[in-house]
Amino acid sequence: QKSSIEKCSVDIQQSRNKTTERPGLLNCPIYWQQLREKCLLFSHTVNPWNNSLADCSTKESSLLLIRDKDELIHTQNLIRDKAILFWIGLNFSLSEKNWKWINGSFLNSNDLEIRGDAKENSCISISQTSVYSEYCSTEIRWICQKELTPVRNKVYPDS
């Protein structure tokens, strides 16, 4: 049995998958911050996790997915205020009893050192220094991401 938050996450991902393909993003839009091959948008308002998830979806983006410890550190370096927490795209799957990214993959236990409990209705936030498990109903800021399209050199066949 899926929790309401898991259902929301799956619904949003499916609706995103149904949308027509858009041309690749070569540069970050105005107001988005470039971090390597991603564009990040740090919210200025607060929301529970599922509203944050939905907001990113309306912006044709997703809640932040963090590949590894290195990407976490680089993202945290963009957070100047120690007291501010941001939702990312990771929550606890009750059915699988594991932390699950909104793209369907599971957390590699070595990637993030999470402070707090792994239990139902828990979602992950990051601060300047740490990664926390919070009640998903907690209203905090969030980070949306868009992937930049890598520019590949075109190879032309011999004429």
């Epitope: 993003l25 839009p29 105005i30 107001y31 988005w32 911050q33 470039q34 948008l41 200025h44 309306t58 912006k59 044709e60 983006s61 963009l78 957070i79 100047r80 205020d81 501010i84 949306c144 868009k146």
Partner: antibody, heavy 116, light 111 residues
Framework: QVQLQESGPGLVKPSETLSLTCTVS????????WSWIRQPPGKGLEWIGY???????NYNPSLKSRVTISVDTSKNQFSLKLSSVTAADTAVYYC??????????WGQGTLVTVSS | DIVMTQTPLSSPVTLGQPASISCRSS???????????LSWLQQRPGQPPRLLIY???NRFSGVPDRFSGSGAGTDFTLKISRVEAEDVGVYYC????????FGGGTKVEIK
């Protein structure tokens, strides 16, 4: 209530650098975007650029080669430098808080005259 | 650059009567995040600009409900339902789909 106040010299010589500072009170600069806008006497508004509190900037392409905007979060201030000024840079310079395209709080503006 | 064209240049209005200002952009103002960053500002004589409307139709806090915004894509309108003496000034539209640009301004004056 967020308040912004511009400060800096009112007279700058041609070819020199115009330097202005905006002090933010009643709210933290560690959020939102912070913009500079100018208005030549009797004319319309021109956006110069913004800075995000983490230090990333975006400038008007027509001014990009001459503009630098910086931020000092410890002082709740952000600053504008415009190099190689000419008489065409004479304007009232405003600082404003930029909530993604909504310039919701403005300073009173400061007139900068470029003249020898 | 996105060019913002405002009409009319000047709008003489009778107190208590409605006023309407049009703003047209040279290309669509739908940002790649799905929002339309079109705002309206009022500049009273000798004062800095003041935000009235953001994202097409959202009134900023403290703005009287006689001000309303509408439109989509490239065509936008600011309406004042009943003009009051304090509404005299220049009104600007502004886009932020790309680097921000302003319309040339519309002067609202009392007949």
């Amino acid at each position: 209530q967020v308040q912004l106040q511009e400060s800096g010299p009112g007279l700058v010589k041609p070819s020199e650098t115009l330097s202005l500072t905006c002090t933010v009170s009643g709210g933290s600069i560690s959020s939102y975007y912070w913009s500079w806008i100018r208005q030549p006497p009797g004319k319309g508004l021109e956006w110069i650029g913004y800075i995000y509190y983490i230090g990333t900037t975006n400038y008007n392409p027509s001014l990009k080669s001459r503009v630098t905007i910086s931020v000092d979060t410890s002082k709740n201030q952000f600053s504008l430098k415009l190099s190689s000024v000419t008489a065409a840079d004479t304007a009232v310079y405003y600082c404003a808080r930029d909530r993604m395209g909504a310039l919701d709080y403005w300073g009173q503006g400061t007139l900068v005259t470029v003249s020898s | 650059d996105i060019v913002m064209t405002q009409t009319p240049l000047s709008s003489p209005v009778t107190l208590g009567q409605p006023a309407s200002i049009s703003c047209r952009s040279s290309q669509s103002l739908v940002h790649s995040d799905g929002n339309t960053y079109l705002s309206w500002l009022q500049q009273r004589p000798g004062q800095p600009p003041r935000l009235l409307i953001y994202e097409i139709s959202n009134r900023f806090s403290g703005v009287p409900d006689r001000f309303s915004g509408s439109g989509a894509g490239t065509d936008f309108t600011l309406k004042i339902s009943r003009v009051e003496a304090e509404d005299v000034g220049v009104y600007y539209c502004m886009q932020a789909a790309q680097f921000p640009t302003f319309g040339g301004g519309t002067k609202v004056e009392i007949k």
